[in-house]
Interface confidence: medium
C-alpha cells in the first residue's frame, strides 16, 4: 500500500518542519521532580518497541509504523548499556539493581553489589545497595510497585530486596542452609525491608502458609500457599498500618483505590505471575493500566510526592516462549499504562522514565509490505522453498526437531496467539539479548537523559531529579519534598 | 570475569555522578553549523553497535562492554523510524532519500518522492527531491562523498542522484527502453547532476567504456569498464575543473590530499565495492579513516564550510552474508573514521551525525560471560545437544540444508572471519530489519536530535543547522556560510 499523501514531498517536509519546531521549543526544566515514575518494559528491546508500534497502529486501523506509542512522545532518549558485572548479556535481577539502585551487580542477584556471589548467602551482608524507592520513602514520599509478574519477581524486587538468588520467592525456595545463615526470601523482604504504600501484581502463593487454599483457585493445590514458616505475610503487613487494605480481584481494587480511608494497598491478583493480557479475565483481574491508575490515585494524595515503579513484566515471558503475539500485546498494554499515567500526572512535577532491563534475540525482517500484519509472512519463499515469518528469533523453543526439517508456515498459523516464531538454535527458553536498550524521558530533569549511558545512570538521574540521596544538595527549585 | 573495582558500589556511584555532571553541563549551542558531516553505518542497528563496542574494546585488551565507541561519546541520541512508504522494512535507496533529502520514497528508488515507482522510468521526472548536499553546494559550501562501497551505490547516490532503480550503476545496467526515455545511470548522474568536490570509494568499472582494462586488475576482463555509451566519465569529470585530480590507489590519494593545487578529487580504489577491511591491501587501498581524513583536508579549505557524507557501507554486506566478523570489523573501521574526523574538526562549528539507514536481523544473546569473545559460544548446549554461538541471525545464508540437521560448532570455527552464523530461515542473503535505529549527534544544533523521529528528520536538522533551504531564515548566529 502506498498512501497517496505520502507521495507528495510536502507531506514529509511539513511533518519534519513541525518536528523541528517542536525540538526548538524544548526547554529543559530547572525544577526538581516532586514525583518519579519508572516504567520498565521487561525484555523490551528496540525491535520489540518498533514491532509493538506497528501492531498498536494496526489495531487502530492504521498502516502501522507512522503511528506513535505513548513512549514515542517522550522528548528525550538515551541508550542504556545493560551488561552485568559478570555477563555480557544480563538477567532481570542484575539489571534491576542497576536501574533501581544505581550500582551494577552480578547475574541473578538483586539489590547487591558485585561483591556478592550468586547463590552464596554468606556474601549478602555488607553488600546491600539501597534503591531510589527506599530513598524516596525516607524523604517522606509515598512509594509503589506495580507489575504484571509476581511482585516478588526480579524487577520489582530490585526496589526493596537484597538477595543472592532471584529465585528465592518464598522461604520454600531458599535452601535450609541459607535460611540458617539468615538469608530471607523475597516475599518476607517485601513486607519487612521497608514501608511500601502500594503493592500491585501477582504472587499470592508466596505470602501464605503451605496448605492455604488460593481464593481464586481453591481446588488447585499447586496454586495455594507455599510458605514453610507458617507465616501469613499479608496478615503481618495489614497489622503494620491502620489504613492498610488487601485485595485479590479487580472489583476490590477499584473500590479500594477510591476509598479515602485506604492509606496502604496490597493487591495480589494471581498466585504467581498475572495472566497474559490476552488471557486475562477482565471481571477478576485488573489490567496493568488499571493497576497503574489505582496506584496513582493513592500515591498522589501525598503532598511530598511519590515514587512509582510500573512493570510490563510479561513482555519478557512472551519472548522467552518465542511467542511474539504475547510479547507484543503485553507491550501494548504496557504502553497503554504509560499513556494513562500521562493523563493522570503533570510533566511539570513528574519525571517519567520508560526503559527496558534488557532486550531479546527477536528480529523483524524480510521486507514485508507496509500495512501487512506484523505476524505475517515475508514476501517470497526461503531457500528450502517454504514460507517464513517476518518475526523470528535467534534462539528459542520455536524449533521443530522432528526430521530436522524446518516446518512450513501459513499466514493463519503465524497469526495465532499461540504460534511460536522459528529460531536458529533450539532452546527450551529463548534468551535475552545484550544490545543497548532505549530510555525515554519526560518531565523535570528529563533533559539529563542523553547519549549512551550505563544502565546505572537511570537510578542516579531519578535520585538527582528528586534531590534524594546522594544528591540532597541538588540545587534545584522548587526543592524536592515541597508541594507545588 | 568480575573486575575487582566493579565490586565496589563506589565505582558505579562515582561513574554515574560524573556522567550526571557532564549531562548538567550540556549547553545547546545557539549558533549555526558551518560544516555538516553525516556518518552512515549501512545496516548498523543497535545490536551491531553494541557488538562492535565489545569487539573494539576487546581488541584493546579490555573486557568489552564498558568501553566507548567514538559514536558513544556524542552527547545527543534519537531513534529514527526507517520504514519506506511502501515497506515496513526498507532498503538503502529509500532510506538514503529520507536522511539525505528529507522525504520518504519507495523501496529501491533513490532521490525521488514516493510518487515514483520502482523500475518505471516514466515516473522519474517531476518527482525528484533535492539532497542537503546539493543545497549545501548551492550555498557555496564544498561537498564530498566517501564510502567503502562503490560511489554509485544506493546510500551515496542519495546525495546526488534520482533514479527509479538503485541497480542502474552504469548505462549497461539500464534497460534500453529506459535509456530511450531519458533515464540516466547513476555514474552519469554522479558527474553531471551537481559539482561534487570530493568523491572517494569504489566503483571504477562504471566510469569507463566496455573493454577498458582496470589499472589494478588489467587481466581480469570482468573488472574492466562496463559502459556501453563509450564514455570515459572520469575524463569528462576532470575536464570540468582545472584543479581536478583522479586517483586510484592509496599512495596517490595521500599525495593529492596534501597538494594545494587540487580543488576537486575523485578516488576510485576498486572496480566495484572496496574490499572488506580485513581483506584490504593497505599498500594499494586506503582505509575509510584515511579517505575521511583526505576528504576533510580538502573540504576544510573552504571558508564557507562543507558538507561531507561518510559511509561504512559494507557493515551491511557482512550482515547479508551472515558473517558477523566482517560486519563488526567494518563497524570498527567506521567508528575509527568518526574518531579521526572528530580530531580534525571542531564541535564549535561542525554538526556531526552518526546513524544507520536500517538494521539487520542480527542478535547477540545466550548469556556469555563478561570478557568472552563476541564470536564465541554460549555457555551450555542447545536442545539438540550441540553448541551454539552468541551471535545469530533470524534469517540468512548461515544455514546448512544437508540432512536438515543444525551443524555443531566449535569456538575455533565460530571465531573464523569466514564463519557464517546460523539462522532460523535459509536465505541466499540475510535481510534488513525494520526496528528503529540510533542517531548520535554532536555540534551546533545537535540538541534538536531528540526523542523518536521519522528518518526524514535527519536531513531537516542538517539543513536547519546550516541555514540551508528551506531554512535560510533559520535565525541562528553566526549565519551559515560565514567563517568563524
Amino acid at each position: 500500500i502506498i498512501p497517496v499523501e505520502e507521495e507528495n514531498p510536502d507531506f514529509w517536509n511539513r511533518q519534519a518542519a513541525e518536528a523541528l519546531g517542536a525540538a526548538k521549543k524544548l526547554q529543559p526544566a530547572q525544577t526538581a521532580a516532586k514525583n518519579l515514575i519508572i516504567f520498565l518494559g521487561d525484555g523490551m528491546g528496540v525491535s520489540t518497541v518498533t514491532a509493538a508500534r506497528i501492531l498498536k497502529g494496526q489495531k487502530k486501523d492504521k498502516l502501522g509504523p507512522e503511528t506513535f506509542l505513548a513512549m514515542d512522545r517522550f522528548p528525550y532518549v538515551a541508550l542504556s548499556k545493560t551488561y552485568s558485572v559478570d555477563k555480557h548479556v544480563p538477567d532481570s535481577g542484575a539489571t534491576a539493581t542497576a536501574y533501581l539502585c544505581g550500582v551494577k551487580g552480578n547475574f541473578q542477584t538483586i539489590g547487591l553489589s558485585a561483591a556478592a556471589r550468586f547463590n552464596q548467602c554468606n556474601t549478602t551482608r555488607g553488600n546491600e545497595v539501597i534503591s531510589v524507592m527506599n530513598r524516596a520513602k525516607k524523604a517522606g514520599k509515598s512509594v509503589g510497585v506495580v507489575t504484571t509478574t509476581r511482585v516478588q519477581h526480579a524487577s520489582p524486587a530490585g526496589a526493596y530486596a537484597h538477595t543472592v538468588n532471584r529465585n528465592w520467592y518464598s522461604d520454600a525456595d531458599v535452601p535450609a542452609s541459607a535460611r540458617q545463615e539468615g538469608c530471607q526470601d523475597i516475599a518476607t523482604q517485601l513486607i519487612s525491608n521497608m514501608d511500601i504504600d502500594v503493592i500491585l501484581g501477582g504472587g499470592r502463593k508466596y505470602m501464605f502458609p503451605m496448605g492455604t487454599p488460593d481464593p481464586e483457585y481453591p481446588d488447585d493445590y499447586s496454586q495455594g500457599g507455599t510458605r514453610l514458616d507458617g507465616k501469613n505475610l499479608v496478615q503481618e503487613w495489614l497489622a503494620k498500618h491502620q489504613g492498610a487494605r488487601y485485595v485479590w480481584n479487580r472489583t476490590e481494587l477499584l473500590q479500594a483505590s477510591l476509598d479515602p480511608s485506604v492509606t496502604h494497598l496490597m493487591g495480589l491478583f494471581e498466585p504467581g505471575d498475572m495472566k497474559y493480557e490476552i488471557h486475562r479475565d477482565s471481571t477478576l483481574d485488573p489490567s496493568l493500566m488499571e493497576m497503574t491508575e489505582a496506584a496513582l490515585l493513592l500515591l498522589s494524595r501525598n503532598p511530598r510526592g511519590f515514587f512509582l515503579f510500573v512493570e510490563g513484566g510479561r513482555i519478557d515471558h512472551g519472548h522467552h516462549e518465542s511467542r511474539a503475539y504475547r510479547a507484543l500485546t503485553e507491550t501494548i498494554m504496557f504502553d497503554d499504562a504509560i499513556e494513562r499515567a500521562g493523563q493522570l500526572t503533570s510533566e511539570e512535577d513528574t519525571l517519567s522514565l520508560v526503559t527496558a532491563d534488557h532486550s531479546h534475540v527477536f528480529s523483524f525482517g524480510g521486507y514485508p509490505l507496509r500495512g501487512s500484519s506484523i505476524f505475517g509472512l515475508a514476501p517470497g519463499k526461503a531457500r528450502d522453498r517454504k514460507a517464513y515469518t517476518v518475526l523470528l528469533y535467534g534462539n528459542g523453543p520455536g524449533y521443530v526437531l522432528k526430521d530436522g526439517a524446518r516446518p512450513d508456515v501459513t499466514e493463519s498459523e503465524s497469526g495465532s496467539p499461540e504460534y511460536r516464531q522459528q529460531s536458529a538454535v533450539p532452546l527450551d527458553g529463548e534468551t535475552h539479548a545484550g544490545e543497548d536498550v532505549a530510555v525515554f524521558a519526560r518531565g523535570p530533569q528529563a533533559h539529563l537523559v542523553h547519549g549512551v549511558q550505563e544502565q546505572t545512570f537511570i537510578a542516579h538521574v531519578m535520585a538527582f531529579a528528586a534531590c534524594l540521596e546522594p544528591y540532597t544538595a541538588c540545587d534545584l527549585a522548587p526543592r524536592a519534598g515541597t508541594t507545588d | 570475569i568480575i573486575p575487582v573495582e566493579e565490586e565496589n558500589p563506589d565505582f558505579w556511584n562515582r561513574q554515574a555522578a560524573e556522567a550526571l555532571g557532564a549531562a548538567k553541563k550540556l549547553q545547546p549551542a545557539q549558533t549555526a553549523a558551518k560544516n555538516l558531516i553525516i556518518f552512515l553505518g549501512d545496516g548498523m542497528g543497535v545490536s551491531t553497535v553494541t557488538a562492535a563496542r565489545i569487539l573494539k574494546g576487546q581488541k584493546k585488551d579490555k573486557l568489552g562492554p564498558e568501553t566507548f565507541l567514538a559514536m558513544d561519546r556524542f552527547p545527543y541520541v534519537a531513534l529514527s523510524k526507517t520504514y519506506s512508504v511502501d515497506k515496513h522494512v526498507p532498503d538503502s535507496g529509500a532510506t538514503a532519500t529520507a536522511y539525505l533529502c528529507g522525504v520518504k520514497g519507495n523501496f529501491q528508488t533513490i532521490g525521488l518522492s514516493a510518487a515514483a515507482r520502482f523500475n518505471q522510468c516514466n515516473t522519474t521526472r517531476g518527482n525528484e527531491v533535492i539532497s542537503v548536499m546539493n543545497r549545501a553546494k548551492k550555498a557555496g559550501k564544498s561537498v564530498g562523498v566517501v564510502t567503502t562501497t562503490r560511489v554509485q551505490h544506493a546510500s551515496p547516490a542519495g546525495a546526488y542522484a534520482h533514479t527509479v532503480n538503485r541497480n542502474w550503476y552504469s548505462d549497461a545496467d539500464v534497460p534500453a527502453s529506459a535509456r530511450q526515455e531519458g533515464c540516466q545511470d547513476i555514474a552519469t548522474q554522479l558527474i553531471s547532476n551537481m559539482d561534487i568536490d570530493v568523491i572517494l570509494g569504489g566503483g571504477r568499472k562504471y566510469m569507463f567504456p566496455m573493454g577498458t582494462p582496470d589499472p589494478e586488475y588489467p587481466d581480469d576482463y570482468s573488472q574492466g569498464g562496463t559502459r556501453l555509451d563509450g564514455k570515459n566519465l572520469v575524463q569528462e569529470w576532470l575536464a570540468k575543473h582545472q584543479g581536478a585530480r583522479y586517483v586510484w590507489n592509496r599512495t596517490e590519494l595521500l599525495q593529492a590530499s596534501l597538494d594545494p593545487s587540487v580543488t576537486h578529487l575523485m578516488g576510485l580504489f576498486e572496480p566495484g565495492d572496496m574490499k572488506y577491511e580485513i581483506h584490504r591491501d593497505s599498500t594499494l587501498d586506503p582505509s575509510l579513516m584515511e579517505m575521511t581524513e583526505a576528504a576533510l583536508l580538502l573540504l576544510s579549505r573552504n571558508p564557507r564550510g562543507f558538507f561531507l557524507f561518510v559511509e561504512g557501507g559494507r557493515i551491511d554486506h557482512g550482515h547479508h552474508e551472515s558473517r558477523a566478523y566482517r560486519a563488526l570489523t567494518e563497524t570498527i573501521m567506521f567508528d575509527d573514521a568518526i574518531e579521526r574526523a572528530g580530531q580534525l574538526t571542531s564541535e564549535e562549528d561542525t554538526l556531526s551525525l552518526v546513524t544507520a539507514d536500517h538494521s539487520h536481523v542480527f542478535s547477540f544473546g545466550g548469556y556469555p560471560l563478561r570478557g568472552s569473545s563476541i564470536f564465541g559460544l554460549a555457555p551450555g548446549k542447545a536442545r539438540d545437544r550441540k553448541a551454539y554461538t552468541v551471535l545469530l541471525y533470524g534469517n540468512g545464508p548461515g544455514y546448512v540444508l544437508k540432512d536438515g540437521a543444525r551443524p555443531d560448532v566449535t569456538e575455533s570455527e565460530s571465531g573464523s572471519p569466514e564463519y557464517r552464523q546460523q539462522s532460523a530461515v535459509p536465505l541466499d542473503g540475510e535481510t534488513h530489519a525494520g526496528e528503529d535505529v540510533a542517531v548520535f549527534a554532536r555540534g551546533p544544533q545537535a540538541h534538536l536530535v531528540h526523542g523518536v523521529q521519522e528518518q526524514t528528520f535527519i536531513a531537516h536538522v542538517m539543513a536547519f543547522a546550516a541555514c540551508l533551504e528551506p531554512y535560510t531564515a533559520c535565525d541562528l548566529a553566526p549565519r551559515a556560510g560565514t567563517t568563524d
Partner: antibody, heavy 123, light 106 residues
C-alpha cells in the same frame, strides 16, 4: 470509477427487521474497509458500523447506539455490503449511506459515499 | 469513545469573507481528522483528510490545520457555491462526526 448503490430502504414498523444492501463496483471490493453511516431528517451524520478488509480478516465494529441490534456483513463474491437491522425503533428513521474507506496514510477516512437509501420506522 | 465538538452550529457570512469552523476532540486524535461538505439531498463530499490534505479537485480556498485535540477548517474567500453544511470526522479511533455547521450567505 468507484460506485456505491444502496438499496433495501422503505417503510417498516417498530420492532421489525430490515436488511440494507450496497452494491459496489469500480474497485477491488475485498481490499477496502466499508462502513454504514446514517442521517436522521434535519440532523447530523452518525457512523454506525465498520467491516474491515481481507487483510484484517473482515472484522467488525459498531457504534454504541446500534451494537447488538445491527449487523454489518459482506458478500465478497458479489461485492455487496449489508446492514441487517433488527428491533427497529422510530429513532432509526434516517437516510442510510454506505461508504468506502480510502487507505491513505490516515488509514480509513470515508472517501466514497453512495447516494443513500431512506428508512422510515413508523407504525 | 472519542467525542467531537464542532462550532459554531451555524454561521452567516458574505461572499469573499474568510470563514472558520473548529472541531475539538475529547482526546488527542493524532491529526486523523477529515472535513466534509454536504448539500441538501446529497451525500457528503470529502474535502480534506489528515488535517490538511486537500482531496484532488477541491479548490485551494479550502484548508485545514491543527494538532492534538484542536482543529480548524477555513474557507479563505467564501463563494456562493460553498453554501452547505460542513462536518468534521475523527477517524483515529473508529469514527465520530462533529454536529455540523450550517453555512449561509448574508
Amino acid at each position: 470509477e468507484v460506485q456505491l448503490v444502496e438499496s433495501g430502504g422503505g417503510l417498516v414498523q417498530p420492532g421489525r427487521s430490515l436488511r440494507l444492501s450496497c452494491t459496489a463496483s469500480g474497485f477491488t471490493f475485498t481490499d477496502y474497509y466499508m462502513s454504514w453511516v446514517r442521517q436522521a431528517p434535519g440532523k447530523g451524520l452518525e457512523w454506525l458500523a465498520l467491516i474491515r478488509n481481507k487483510a484484517t480478516g473482515y472484522t467488525t465494529e459498531y457504534s454504541a447506539s446500534v451494537k447488538g441490534r445491527f449487523t454489518i456483513s459482506r458478500d465478497n463474491s458479489k461485492s455487496i455490503l449489508y446492514l441487517q437491522m433488527n428491533s427497529l425503533k422510530t429513532e432509526d428513521t434516517a437516510v442510510y449511506y454506505c461508504a468506502r474507506a480510502s487507505f491513505y496514510y490516515d488509514g480509513k477516512v470515508l472517501a466514497y459515499w453512495g447516494q443513500g437509501t431512506l428508512v422510515t420506522v413508523s407504525s | 469513545d472519542t467525542q467531537m465538538t464542532q462550532s459554531p452550529s451555524s454561521l452567516s457570512a458574505s461572499v469573499g469573507d474568510r470563514v472558520t469552523i473548529t472541531c475539538k476532540a475529547s482526546q488527542d486524535i493524532n491529526k486523523y481528522i477529515a472535513w466534509y461538505q454536504q448539500k441538501p439531498g446529497k451525500a457528503p463530499k470529502l474535502l480534506i483528510h489528515y488535517t490538511s490534505t486537500l482531496q484532488p479537485g477541491v479548490p485551494s480556498r479550502f484548508s485545514g490545520s491543527g494538532s492534538g485535540r484542536d482543529y480548524t477548517f477555513t474557507i479563505s474567500s467564501l463563494q456562493p457555491e460553498d453554501i452547505a453544511t460542513y462536518y468534521c470526522l475523527q477517524y483515529d479511533n473508529l469514527y465520530t462526526f462533529g454536529q455540523g455547521t450550517k453555512l449561509e450567505i448574508k
